[in-house]
């Protein structure tokens, strides 16, 4: 039961730390500049990913997508990238996640195949969630470490005389849902691992025998009533009056100790 | 990528009036224009300015005086100058600033019109 509410719980916190970052890549606040001290403007301006966004005091607001004309910082195509490759890698994540759940069936599909998508789910979670905080990180960097060096002109309220100061740059709101929704993509991916390692069947340290009644279809074995069952014996209609005892490895496929949790 | 250039400038008489022209030429629109002049052996002062939306704004010493206004599709910034004193006299720049459409914002300016009040 634990194994399915930690997969579970996994699926949802991953689920929800993508639409994160899906959200944070579209978003337009990843930086934000103040320029209501500009007596010529007196607007509010924020840059996104894929376009940047000028607010007038007077409500008007207006995005233009960037021109490459006006030349685009490398880093901001590697950022653009490493969200991209999270959100991609995130969503088949999540779709392999969804046949990995325990509590959904399909057809017959082993608890050993189940943990192996799950894993596989897990691993590709953790890798988007450090994309994307990578791509957050990267950006944050830029604004700290080169923006101050914007040779935009901002114009001083003191007697109306012009001059260039320097234009401060600040971290926009996307910015912490990266962050955020990364982290919970990351902490729902190491679920998702932690949960493979319940779901996979442990290997026996011995051959259990399989011992086979004459004229019956019932395997007995060791193990009780799931061994008793049947279960996965005979499972291409061969002869059961092939020579009596056969070992566990060649019978197709047997019930894990988990299939009945 | 955007081109200023002024006109309308020249020499006129105290309490006359003037109108300056700004023509922008290039790709991309600007989101705010203004104009700023320079007075003979003084630092520049921002005179007026307008933004997209159509905010204005003007300097003090111009205000109920000078009119800026915007034809967005001439893509010209216009400065009407009335009751000029002697204290206008000065170089008078056009300014451009994109904000949108680009990753950091860019200033240009155009190379000034002279504007002369004597009698």
């Known amino acids: 039961m634990a194994v399915t509410a930690c997969q579970g719980l996994g699926f949802v916190v991953s689920l929800i730390g993508i639409a994160g970052i899906i959200a944070a890549t579209c978003m337009d606040q990843w930086s934000t500049q103040d320029l209501y001290n500009n007596p010529v403007t007196a607007v509010f301006n924020y840059q996104g990913l894929w376009r940047s966004c000028v607010r007038e005091s007077s409500g008007f607001t207006e995005c233009r997508g960037y021109f490459t004309l006006l030349g685009l910082p490398a880093m901001l195509q590697a950022v653009r990238a490493l969200m991209i490759v999270g959100i991609v890698l995130g969503a088949i994540g999540l779709l392999v996640s969804i046949f990995a759940l325990k509590c959904i069936r399909i057809g017959s599909m082993e608890d050993s195949a189940k943990a192996n998508m799950t894993l596989t789910s897990g691993i590709m979670f953790i890798v988007s969630g450090l994309c994307a905080i990578a791509g957050v990180s990267v950006f944050a960097n830029m604004l700290v470490t080169n923006f101050w060096m914007s040779t935009a002109n901002m114009y001083t309220g003191m007697g109306g005389m012009v001059q260039t100061v320097q234009t401060r740059y600040t971290f926009g709101a996307a910015l912490f849902v990266g962050w955020v929704a990364g982290g919970l993509t990351l902490i729902g991916g190491v679920m998702m691992c932690i949960a493979c390692r319940g779901l996979a069947p442990e290997e026996t340290n011995y051959k259990a025998v399989s011992y086979h009644a004459s004229g019956h279809s019932v395997a007995y074995k060791p193990g009780g009533f799931k061994a008793s069952t049947g279960f996965g014996s005979n499972t291409k209609n061969k002869k059961i009056y092939d020579g009596g005892a056969r070992t566990e490895d060649e019978v197709q496929s047997y019930p894990s100790k988990h299939d009945y949790v | 990528q955007v081109q200023l250039v002024e006109s309308g400038g020249g020499l006129v008489q105290p309490g006359g009036s003037l109108r300056l022209s700004c023509a922008a030429s290039g790709e991309i629109s600007s989101d705010a224009m203004a104009w700023v002049r320079q007075a003979p052996g003084k630092g520049l002062e921002w005179v007026a300015g307008m933004t997209r939306g159509g905010s204005t704004n003007y300097a003090d010493s111009v205000k109920g005086r000078f009119t800026i206004s915007r034809d967005n599709s001439k893509n010209t910034l216009y400065l009407q100058m009335n009751s000029l004193r002697a204290e206008d006299t000065a170089v008078y720049y056009c300014?451009?600033?994109?904000?949108?459409?680009?990753?950091?914002?860019?200033?240009?300016w155009g190379q000034g019109t002279l504007v002369t009040v004597s009698s």
């Open positions: 300014n451009a600033e994109i904000y949108t459409g680009t990753f950091y914002p860019r200033s240009y």
